[in-house]
């Protein structure tokens, strides 16, 4: 919020407290104050300031101790490079301004690892990796020195150590020290230095958090015990066995405000529902606290793994549960985890070494009282055997990430808390609470779950495509008769899946143009596969001119799909993805997939549309219930189908019909929808159960949809579980796990 | 040139110990790890240890710990193996080596070795 | 610990032939970050201290001949020979230093045929 002249409660004047280029805004309810930049500056000579007991605001003081008048926004500069190993870096300068590039270069014999060019970037830290010059040759890589540290130590055998240093008045996240270790890895995190105006932005956030989070072992499972070398892409291992805790520690003291719990509670939502889009159950424990810790979910209760249970009892707890006592106690927080972790009676249960404990921690940073938390870490450790035998340290049990928000967090207590692990990033520092749950949105999409089906970016910056990766343009180009236009859905790397009534058989596969997320481009076309039982004609003798029974059809492409935030699979039924997609059991079975997505009922489902340019979902009702005779007996008002006697030659068991007015008034799909997925949304994850196949009224006559239109106006789709044993066969190499 | 020359054999008594040295020449003592590797007669070759002659700091194979003992004399770039309590399966060459300056893991150059026979 | 496997025990080779010797670990000793296979083969004369050949698996140590090559990653290595002089009869050795302790194979005794 913009300053205000009022009064804070505190009692310190907001005279001649103005910060030149910038603004402030009052925190603490008036305890402290952030001054605030425009992008691109920062505050100097400092971010914050306290409002002292003697009436008075803490002084502006420069790093050196040099007493500053007024604050102003500087422009943000990235630190230059204090020394580059075996090699050259250009152009050099004192400082550089934001965008402004460098590049490095190896002397001969020397090869480059990292990023040959960086950028400076707007949060003042430089684009891409840090850039290192190395011979090979000694038993542990070089592990260069991260812009803006001093490194002392330049040799790299087995157990020699290197340490690192920041210029005065910056802080020092990751390890001070590392050690090569056996097996040629590292020690620790690579260090940075922070000044107190940089944050992480959410996508490098979402980033690194997520590749720690989700880095799958090659090699060895942890549990047989794998030495300190054994490093092979580590990982929580998210393990379907579920022999895995989760703990969700919660800052709801005064400092972080109720916007902020609020933001917080939504953020593990979101890494909740991830965790659970992987097919894995963990434990939960879930503890909030101020002065005093409140346990709300205990990983020993037999609810705690399950997902909805726990989403449901972290949306239940308000922030003014903590109101009466609202210091910051993170030690007692982190007891109350210790005691969640510990066994009664010092008794280890069985299998307690094989039990995986992740600590996501979020909070400001800023614990007053009770001592600090750090002890309670190594407590932690002790109990789980972790870094005590040289041969099976452990420390693949436990992660312990700190996501610190907003001006006041204190950076060397966040980064002493978490966990530090060879190229993997447990300490972040976000700027708000905005920041961090675009942290989490963006983490929902990262790379590693890009194969799962169904699963889309339902953020506010998130495109058309970004809302349906899955849906694809289908057009058909033939000469001196126009052109087909279609709709499908990517079901797998491959292959598009759409109605066949969109091609005739004599159009020629480079007639035939496809295009996903978006793109301009269009897609090369192997072949079109039909359903063998369609036939548009099969029944003319009988007086019915089109004949839609098993109108499906596969696009095979001839170039893999690279999935990405816009494109991506939708899930089909009776697969292992939709299993999970579901959070069913792994043991389901294809009849319990189809009575969870269609039941004996009205059910809840949508399908997408482009009106002027812009995907839409459309939100209709599958009438498989007591409606679903009446709702087929209406396709009697199709043109060409009124003379049909018996409704059930033309809507055969392989049709689920939508549209009408009950028990809401159902949009229809137009002609250009054709071929396009019936979808079922559950559990945060989308299902294909249909591919819309034809129409009773066409309602949208003249390229608009009417919006009046009768109750007998009706669609049908193919029932994806009527043509399971064709999709099986023809999807049979794309990794499907066809149930 | 790298020199690394050693002591004359020895003959043990079970039980007894044996104080093996090994005397670097050509290059600077402190700047590289001295590791020891023995090989018992007709067998394959075995890792005992390393000492690093700059710290004095050393790490032991398991299956030793505790009967072998690593030291120098940066005074006279000397680095010795004294192993106690020996038996009869002792009974072996011993060789120091020196790794690279970069990498004390590929033993690039080695004593002449030191026969050690333990015998009642 | 990691168990270095050779094989053969033993080989005859006639002069100007090839000759292969297998060394097989009982873990990866590849680091899949660096890319490096912490793996050496060294050879032994009778009465002679071991000769370092090839470290990192395949990079040949100066000064010796390029008919020898290491190659392998991961588990599963060779040592070839491109063509057998008389003065490479001796005994060879892998070693992994991936993990301590550091370990060899029992070594392959190459005779001429």
């Known amino acids: 919020t913009p300053w205000s002249l009022a009064r804070p409660q505190g009692s310190c004047s907001l005279e001649g407290v103005e910060i030149k280029g910038g603004s402030f805004r009052l925190l603490q309810e008036g305890q402290a104050l952030e001054y605030v930049c425009p992008s691109g500056f920062y505050p100097y000579p400092v971010q914050t300031r306290t409002c002292r007991s003697t009436g008075s605001w803490s002084t502006l003081k420069t790093q050196d101790q040099k007493t500053v008048r007024k604050a102003e926004c500087r422009a943000i500069h990235c630190p230059r490079p204090h020394d580059f190993e075996n090699g050259e870096y250009w152009p050099r300068s004192p400082y550089y301004n934001v965008s402004d590039e460098i590049s490095f270069h190896c002397y001969d014999g020397y090869t480059l690892r990292g990023s040959a060019n960086r950028t400076c970037q707007v949060n003042g830290r430089w684009s891409g990796q840090t850039a290192i010059c190395d011979n090979g040759a000694g038993y542990c890589s070089n592990p260069g020195i991260p812009i803006g540290t001093r490194k002392v130590g330049s040799q790299y055998r087995l157990e020699d150590s290197v340490t690192y240093h920041c210029s005065r008045g910056l802080t020092l996240r990751g390890s001070q020290r590392r050690t090569c270790q056996e097996g040629g890895s590292w020690s620790g995190t690579e260090p940075s230095c922070q000044d107190s105006f940089m944050y992480d932005t959410p996508q490098e956030v979402a980033e690194a958090f997520l590749s720690s989070l989700t880095e799958t072992i090659e090699g060895v499972d942890a549990e047989d015990g794998h030495g300190p070398g054994e490093q092979q892409k580590r990982k929580i291992v998210l393990d379907p066995s579920g022999s895995m805790n989760i703990y969700l520690v919660l800052d709801g003291s005064d400092s972080i405000g109720a916007s902020n719990f609020t933001g917080a509670k939504k953020c593990l939502v979101n890494l909740i529902e991830k965790v659970a889009s992987y097919g894995v159950k963990p434990r939960y424990g879930l503890v909030t606290y101020a002065t005093y810790p409140k346990i709300w979910v205990k990983v020993s209760e037999a609810d705690s793994s399950n997902a909805d249970w726990v989403t449901k009892q972290l949306n239940e707890i308000n922030y003014e549960d903590h109101k009466l006592k609202s210091g910051t106690n993170t030690k007692k927080a982190l007891q109350a985890v210790y005691s969640m972790m510990s066994w009664p009676d010092d008794v280890p249960p069985e299998g307690w070494n094989r039990t995986r404990h992740v600590i996501i921690l979020m909070t400001d940073g800023l614990h007053n009282m009770g001592g600090d938390p750090i002890t309670v870490i190594d407590e932690i450790r002790d109990l789980l055997y972790i870094g005590k035998d040289r041969k099976n340290p452990r420390e693949d049990y436990l992660d312990v990430y700190v996501f610190g928000v907003g001006p006041l967090v204190n950076q060397v207590n966040i980064n002493a808390l978490a966990s530090k692990k060879d190229n993997e990033q447990h300490v972040f520092k976000v700027k708000d609470m905005e920041n961090l749950e675009d942290v989490f949105y963006q983490m929902i999409d990262e790379s590693q779950s890009l194969s799962l089906c169904g699963m889309v970016w339902e953020h506010r910056k998130g495109t058309d495509y970004h809302k349906q990766p899955w849906q694809a343009k289908i057009s058909v180009i033939r000469p001196s008769k126009g052109h087909e236009s279609c709709m499908g859905a990517v079901v797998s790397e491959y292959f598009v899946l759409t109605a066949a009534h969109c091609f005739t058989v004599d159009d020629k596969e480079h007639s035939i143009k496809v295009s996903v997320g978006g793109e301009k481009r269009d897609l090369e076309i192997e072949v079109v596969l039909f359903h063998p039982n369609y036939n548009i004609n099969g029944k003319k003798e009988a007086g019915i001119p089109e004949f839609y029974d098993y109108d499906v059809a596969l696009i095979k492409l001839k170039n893999k799909l690279k999935y990405g935030q816009t494109i991506r699979p939708i899930c089909l039924p009776c697969t292992e993805g939709t299993t999970r997609a579901l959070r069913l059991p792994p043991t389901t079975t294809c009849q319990q997939q189809k009575e969870e997505l269609l039941p004996a009922q009205d059910i809840k489902a949508l399908f997408v549309s482009e009106e002027e340019k812009k995907l839409t979902r459309k939100e209709v009702y599958i009438k498989n219930g007591d409606k679903k005779g009446s709702c087929e007996r209406d396709a009697q008002y199709a043109p060409g189908y009124d003379k049909v006697k018996d409704i059930s030659e033309v809507v055969t068991p392989r049709f689920l019909c939508t549209g009408g007015v009950s028990p809401y008034a159902d949009p229809n799909t137009c002609r250009g929808d054709s071929g396009g997925p019936l979808i079922v949304h559950k559990r945060s994850r989308f299902i294909q159960v249909g591919v819309i196949s034809w129409g009773v009224v066409d309602v949208c006559k003249n390229q608009k949809r009417q919006k009046q239109v009768p109750a007998h106006a009706r669609d049908f789709h193919i029932n994806l579980f009527q043509v399971l044993p064709w999709l099986k066969e023809k999807l049979q190499d794309e990794d499907l796990g066809f149930l | 040139q790298v020199q690394l020359v050693q002591s004359g054999a020895e003959v043990k008594k079970p039980g007894a110990s044996v104080k093996v040295s090994c005397k670097a020449s050509?290059?600077?003592?402190?700047?590289?790890?001295m590791t020891w590797v023995r090989q018992a007669p007709g067998q394959g070759l075995e890792w005992m240890g390393w000492i690093n002659p700059n710290s004095g700091g050393t790490k032991y194979a398991q299956k030793f710990q505790g009967r072998v003992t690593m030291t120098r004399d940066t005074s006279i770039s000397t680095a010795y193996m004294e192993l106690s309590r020996l038996r009869s399966d002792d009974t072996a060459v011993y060789y120091c080596?020196?790794?690279?300056?970069?990498?004390?893991?590929?033993?690039?150059?080695w004593g002449q070795g030191t026969l050690v026979t333990v015998s009642s | 610990d990691i168990v270095m496997t050779q094989s053969p025990d033993s080989l005859a080779v006639s002069l100007g032939e090839r000759a292969t010797i297998n060394c097989k670990s009982s873990?990866?000793?590849?680091?899949?970050?660096?890319?490096?296979?912490?793996l050496a083969w060294y050879q032994q004369k009778p009465g002679q201290p071991p000769k370092l050949l090839i470290y990192w698996a395949s990079t040949r140590e100066s000064g010796v001949p390029d008919r020898f090559s290491g190659s392998g990653s991961g588990t599963d290595f060779t040592l070839t020979i491109s063509s057998l002089q008389a003065e490479d009869v001796a005994v060879y050795y892998c070693?992994?230093?991936?993990?301590?302790?550091?370990?060899f194979g029992q070594g392959t005794k190459l005779e001429i045929k």
């Open positions: 070693k992994q230093v991936y993990n301590l302790p550091w370990t």
């Open positions: 080596a020196r790794g690279y300056y970069a990498n004390s893991a590929w033993f690039a150059y």
């Open positions: 873990q990866s000793v590849l680091n899949s970050r660096n890319k490096k296979n912490y």
């Open positions: 050509g290059y600077s003592f402190t700047d590289y790890y």
